[in-house]
């Protein structure tokens, strides 16, 4: 059985979101793929691959780059220089025609907030990491931090408690949260 869960990614302005969507090779290797944002009930296609898909031929639309790896059954999505208004729900889809698209797994809830200084992270850091918890703790929770922290095991009802110096976040009914560090 496949779990369909919404995944939450938190970033600061100026950083880069990098995600992947996997698909059944035998079914969709040669199909066009698209990256869409849900706006109300209507999805808006932001970028789509060429047809037929070819390895290492990235498609760039503004700040979005799609790279399909049909040999590997993966679509790579990169959104650079994230802005607060980019926040929202995103999906990878197999693009057949505008009115018919097959949604790939796990919609992504992107939350972009202003940096503490109100400026984007440095160019070196802004393209970096989706952080995960250390291997000694409950890594299924997602985040990896560069600053000291504790991560408590998620209780059965799926409330995640992530503690970082000077802050505590309680997340209820969110399967995972993946956070990048705040760059001051």
């Amino acid at each position: 059985t496949t779990e369909l869960t919404e995944e939450k990614y938190e970033y600061k302005e100026g950083q880069t979101l990098e995600v992947k969507c996997d698909y059944a090779l035998e079914k969709y290797a040669n199909s066009r793929k698209a990256w869409q944002k849900m706006e109300g009930k209507m999805p808006k296609i932001l970028a789509k691959t060429e047809r037929p898909s070819e390895n290492s031929h990235p498609v760039q639309v503004g700040r979005i780059t799609l790279e399909d790896y049909p040999d590997h059954g993966l679509l790579q999505v990169r959104m650079t220089n994230l802005q607060v208004e980019d926040s929202g729900l995103y999906q990878c889809v197999i693009y057949q025609h505008p009115k018919e698209s097959h949604v790939l797994f796990n919609p992504i809830c992107l939350v972009v907030t202003k940096g503490s200084s109100g400026t984007p992270g440095s160019s070196e850091n802004s393209t970096q990491n989706v952080y995960r918890t250390p291997s000694t703790t409950a890594k299924a929770l997602g985040p990896r931090y560069t600053s000291p922290r504790t991560v408590t095991q998620a209780p059965p009802e799926s409330t995640v408690v992530v503690s970082t110096p000077g802050s505590e976040i309680n997340l209820t009914n969110v399967t995972d949260i993946i956070r990048v560090p705040v760059f001051n």
Epitope: T2, E7, E67, D71, E124, V130, A140
Partner: antibody, heavy 122, light 107 residues
Framework: QVQLVQSGAEVKKPGASVKVSCKAS????????INWVRQATGQGLEWMGW????????GQTQKFRGRVTMTRNTSINTAYMELSSLRSEDTAVYYC???????????????WGRGTLVTVSS | DIQMTQSPSSLSASVGDRVTITCQAS??????LNWYQQKPGKAPKLLIY???NLETGVPSSFSGSGCGTDFTFTISSLQPEDIATYFC?????????FGGGTKVEIE
Amino acid sequence: QVQLVQSGAEVKKPGASVKVSCKASGYTFTRYDINWVRQATGQGLEWMGWLNPNSGNTGQTQKFRGRVTMTRNTSINTAYMELSSLRSEDTAVYYCARGGYTSAWRWYFDLWGRGTLVTVSS
Amino acid sequence: DIQMTQSPSSLSASVGDRVTITCQASQDINNHLNWYQQKPGKAPKLLIYDVSNLETGVPSSFSGSGCGTDFTFTISSLQPEDIATYFCQQYDKLPLTFGGGTKVEIE
């Protein structure tokens, strides 16, 4: 305890198949990719491919396409890698390794099995 | 495929020495570079991810730097327990590729 436990060493004849298992424990199996990496004696590391335990989707490098099959059984948190049409140059240690979160473009392997030695000899 | 060229392939140094290993990618890999340590008969162990981030529990004597195509891994003060082979790995593009490894020995 967070770990990946692999099946034991195998000796196979050329042309045969081998199936290596990798049992995950201590974390949510379906949330992280499982990758397979092999290493011939005294050689470097070679990535073979990946498995998303949640969707069951897989991908392999071109070198192994058609010869390798990656599967999983989520009820027992176990991933499998089957390599067919074995030849002597497939003699190697085969590792399973946990990759990044299934939806993240984060391919670092922070948890490894101990490896399974597969010897192909007539 | 992206080629990862590691050098030197082996080195010998004294306890307390500073040891540097380089890894060169055949194209820009956008800081998608990791470093692993492998001791004889053992599985590799992740030390550094994304160029310079230390994996939890890894001593601060290990560090990484670089950008674009050229990356460096440093052991600030070599200890007997650091005897191992070190590998770099890129993940900017598929297939994932590793460097050939650098075997570090004590003089």
